[in-house]
Interface confidence: low
């Protein structure tokens, strides 16, 4: 190999050992029969050398550094050449370095031809191994602007006072052009400006200077985004840290097309703007840091550019001004991710502040829109608390547990609507009355409706789940002793069509001691399955529940239990069941921890089933499943 560097070229070539490998056989640079491991060639020198091994690329790397001085004379602007030509260099991993020094008043602009650059973060690498490392200078301090791969959006980087550009090419890469040019500009009065150009839909991840280390103190960095007018851009911060400021405040500023309040100033912790049409700028401004404990300012963010969706121009008004203690969250329902660009899915408040999830609270009217390619990627969860603090005021009061129409009209699916119903302890109880009689979900007769009501105790220490109930059954009402949560959970998009079937009224009633009372009015010829609360885990200790079962005059009810014994073993107290005819008050009492469960029995009149638990030994819980079937009295029951 022969390398000859012209005089006055300000180029230095250094061949040195690369990352040590575990290769057994060492390799040397052979020059004038001497074996060396490092060779430096300066301007005006001509050196002939060879290697002592067949694969020098496994051992050595080459660095070609060109110093460009714009301080003492004219600057060589224009397209930057690879000198010496790659064809004259040995096939080693090579790094071309251009170190440009200029006055503070001079702006320098790196212009990248297509393909543009894509910034990568710490630990990431470029697929083709070609990397561009760019740094600037503040006085004597070097500032890393970033490391970039090909195939991105970054088209220009403007700096002042100097720039160092390192282009790393793997030994096997055929590239023989630098791919960039240098131009002079007027002073930019900031650390740097990065221009990012979008031709169509896509995303770009960008980072503050020195990332993941701290952004230089009290500096300003700007990103200019060129976005076709027919597309929309949204900014989201992926990672940021704030330093400890002594003076001024760290912030980001946006110049947004059409905004009457430019620049728009945001804190880093704010939700960032979305749904922006056309070009915009984003600037990061540091502060004067506390000398004792500076902390670090750093920012990694993503700009997502996509077509405006049909929904993005529609404004939905969610009027929660008359609601109390209610929150509505619109959030992503996780979906399959593909490797190709996936448009973002955002919900926007007042069409500007967009994020992947949004919580609206009661007491206000909210205007929202969607920036999303497929609204089935979102769903809604709502929580509302209805509490009574004064039993004299609430007694006999009723509330409708109905999903407000404003919410039903939103174009995203409702997942859960939870009502937390709170009553004063030992003063009031609750009764739930459905618009349509309910069926209890059991595995013998599962619910197959588009929604169910999940009813559970809302007392933190109490582990009591009454069950899941859906319309189309025989349960006319459910009375509960104390605080509960009722969750309307939807299972299918068809809930929108079936929404009229929902409707539950809660009333505050005088306190009673039983944990729950179910009023059941079976329909002829249908089998009603009922099960004790906390199925699978056992009725809680010392808990009592009842079923008030109506039998019409011309019918007979058959009560059937689904196992021979209850299986409960009592540690203290007794577990018992009372079956009582309501007309005659005649009752049968069964000891659940001793007796076998009754055989199927026939009841001509309405009757009660009451089950009271003892304190069971662990593992011997009380779980009962039974059914009620009506048949006409005229049928011969023998």
């Amino acid at each position: 190999f022969e390398i000859a560097l012209p005089r006055e070229s300000n180029i230095t070539v250094l061949i040195k050992l690369g990352t040590p490998t575990l290769l057994a056989k060492p390799c040397y640079i052979v020059i004038s029969k001497r074996h060396i491991t490092m060779l430096s060639i300066k301007s005006g020198e001509r050196i002939v050398f060879t290697f002592s091994c067949q694969s020098p690329e496994n051992h050595f790397v080459i660095e070609i550094q060109k110093n460009i001085d714009c301080m003492s004379g004219p600057c060589p602007f224009g397209e930057v050449q690879l000198q010496p030509s790659t064809s004259l260099l040995p096939t080693l991993n090579r790094t071309f370095i251009w170190d440009v020094k200029a006055h503070k008043s001079i702006g320098l602009e790196l212009q990248f031809s297509i393909p543009r650059l894509r910034q990568i973060g710490p630990g990431e690498s470029c697929p083709d191994g070609v990397t561009h490392s760019i740094s600037g200078r503040i006085d004597a301090t070097v500032v890393r602007i970033g490391t970039f791969c090909s195939n991105g959006t970054v088209s220009r980087i403007k700096m002042q006072e100097g720039v160092k550009m390192a282009l790393h090419l793997p030994w096997f890469h055929p590239r023989n052009v630098s791919g960039f040019s240098i131009a002079n500009r007027s002073s930019i009065k900031r650390l740097c400006i990065i221009e990012s150009v979008f031709e169509g839909e896509g995303s770009a991840t960008l980072m503050s200077a020195n990332y993941p280390e701290g952004f230089p103190e009290d500096e300003l960095m700007t990103w200019q985004f060129v976005v076709p007018a027919h597309l929309r851009a949204s900014v989201s911060f992926l990672n940021f840290n704030l330093s400890n400021c002594e003076r001024k405040e760290e912030r980001v500023e946006y110049y947004i097309p059409g905004s009457t309040t430019n620049p728009e100033v945001f804190k880093l912790e704010d939700k960032q703007p979305g749904n922006m049409a056309g070009n915009f700028n984003l600037s990061l401004q540091g502060c004067d840091q506390d000398a004792q404990s500076p902390g670090i300012l750093r920012l990694q963010f993503q700009v997502l550019v996509q077509h405006p969706q049909n929904e993005s121009n529609k404004i939905y008004v969610v009027d929660l001004s008359n609601e109390r203690a209610m929150s509505l969250t619109i959030e992503p329902r996780p979906v399959k991710q593909s490797r190709k660009f996936v448009p973002g899915c955002f919900v926007c408040l007042e069409s500007r502040t967009c994020s992947s999830n949004l919580t609206l609270t009661s007491g206000s009217k909210h205007k929202i829109s969607f920036l999303c390619d497929d609204l089935t990627r979102l769903w809604m969860n709502v929580e509302k608390t209805i509490s009574c603090t004064d039993h004299r005021y609430c007694q006999r009061k009723s509330y409708s547990l109905q999903v407000p129409s404003d919410i039903l009209h939103l174009p995203v699916e409702l997942h859960d609507f939870s009502w937390k119903l709170l009553v004063p302890k030992d003063r009031l109880s609750l009764v739930l009355v459905p618009a349509q009689k309910l069926q209890q979900h059991t595995h013998e007769k599962p619910c197959n409706t588009s929604f169910s009501y999940l009813v559970a105790s809302a007392i933190p220490s109490q582990d009591l789940y009454f069950g899941s109930f859906c319309p189309g059954g025989s349960i006319k009402q459910i009375q509960v002793k104390q605080n509960i949560s009722v969750t309307l959970r939807t299972f299918a998009p068809s809930f929108q069509q079936e929404a009229s079937r929902q409707g539950l009224t809660v009333s505050f009633i005088p306190y009673f001691k039983e944990e729950g009372v179910f009023t059941v009015t079976p329909d002829t010829k249908s089998k009603v399955y009922l099960r004790t609360p906390n199925w699978d885990r056992g009725l809680p200790s010392l808990t009592s529940v009842s079923w008030n079962i109506s039998v019409p005059r011309d019918q007979v009810a058959c009560l059937t239990f689904f196992k021979e014994r209850s299986g409960v073993v009592c540690q203290t107290g007794r577990a018992f069941m009372i079956i009582q005819e309501q007309r005659t008050r005649a009752e049968e009492i069964f000891s659940l921890d001793e007796d076998v469960l009754p055989k199927p029995s026939f009841h001509h009149h309405s009757f009660w089933v009451n089950i009271s638990n003892c304190s069971p030994t662990s593992g011997k819980q009380l779980d009962l499943l039974f059914s009620v079937t009506l048949t006409p009295r005229t049928v011969d029951l023998t």
Epitope: P334, V335, H443, P446, D463, W535, D536, R537, Q621
Partner: antibody, heavy 119, light 107 residues
Framework: QVQLVQSGSELKKPGASVKVSCKAS????????MHWVRQAPGQGLEWMGW????????TYADDFKGRFVLSLDTSVSTAYLQISSLKAEDTAVYYC????????????WGQGTLVTVSS | EIVLTQSPATLSLSPGERATLSCRAS??????LHWYQQKSGQSPRLLIK???QSISGIPARFSGSGSGSDFTLTISSVEPEDFAVYYC?????????FGQGTKLEIK
């Protein structure tokens, strides 16, 4: 980070008892239920039951009622599975796993404990 | 009890191919179905919850679909580390059952 660490392998004779422990760390034991799953050699997974870590109340699948006892010691954040009157067909890997009380999905699992019953 | 039937019992594929695993429930279980992966000598790992909800840390090539009684786990492009046994699990009602498993093996 969340971890469930189980006790080591056991070799037992038929008729003996064994107690497998599962120590939870990286979260509060009482915030999640603890489930136990059995896997016989070369076979699939069988859900055995679960224990309510707030109340200590266990629940068993039908095939695991009687000789199997689930218990807790919240002071050391540990759940236990005890099997008495061991039989050769109890030879299996036993896993503890963390779950939700309703509609459980098991997001963290112990490394498994192999119990071998052989004369 | 809910019986879950997985098919096929064994699926032979080459890396880069698409894998489709099926799980059928003996009755409607809405979306109360979860998927797990178990590699030889390891504990199971939760892949998908509630039929289609992804789990943090699980590669995006895994996705689930279905509701009612028919469910599918899809691996869009099988990687070498995906060869394992996959189980579905019902959380609809007591007892919480698992399918018998589908073994995904290298062709």
């Amino acid at each position: 980070q969340v971890q469930l660490v189980q006790s080591g392998s056991e070799l037992k004779k038929p008729g003996a008892s064994v107690k497998v422990s599962c120590k939870a760390s990286g979260y509060t034991l009482t915030d999640f239920s603890m489930h136990w799953v059995r896997q016989a050699p070369g076979q699939g997974l069988e859900w055995m039951g679960w224990i309510n870590t707030e109340t200590g109340a266990p629940t068993y699948a039908d095939d695991f009622k009687g000789r199997f006892v689930l218990s807790l010691d919240t002071s050391v954040s540990t759940a236990y599975l005890q099997i008495s009157s061991l039989k050769a067909e109890d030879t299996a890997v036993y896993y503890c796993s963390r779950g939700r009380d309703y509609d459980p999905h098991f997001d963290y699992w112990g490394q498994g404990t192999l119990v071998t019953v052989s004369s | 009890e809910i019986v879950l039937t997985q098919s096929p019992a064994t699926l032979s594929l080459s890396p880069g191919e698409r894998a489709t695993l099926s799980c059928r429930a003996s009755q409607s279980i809405s979306d109360f179905l979860h998927w797990y992966q178990q590699k030889s000598g390891q504990s199971p790992r939760l892949l998908i919850k509630y039929a289609s909800q992804s789990i943090s840390g699980i590669p995006a090539r895994f996705s689930g679909s279905g509701s009612g009684s028919d469910f599918t786990l899809t691996i869009s492009s099988v990687e070498p580390e995906d060869f394992a046994v996959y189980y579905c699990q019902s959380a609809h009602s007591f007892p919480y059952t698992f399918g018998q498993g589908t073994k995904l093996e290298i062709k």
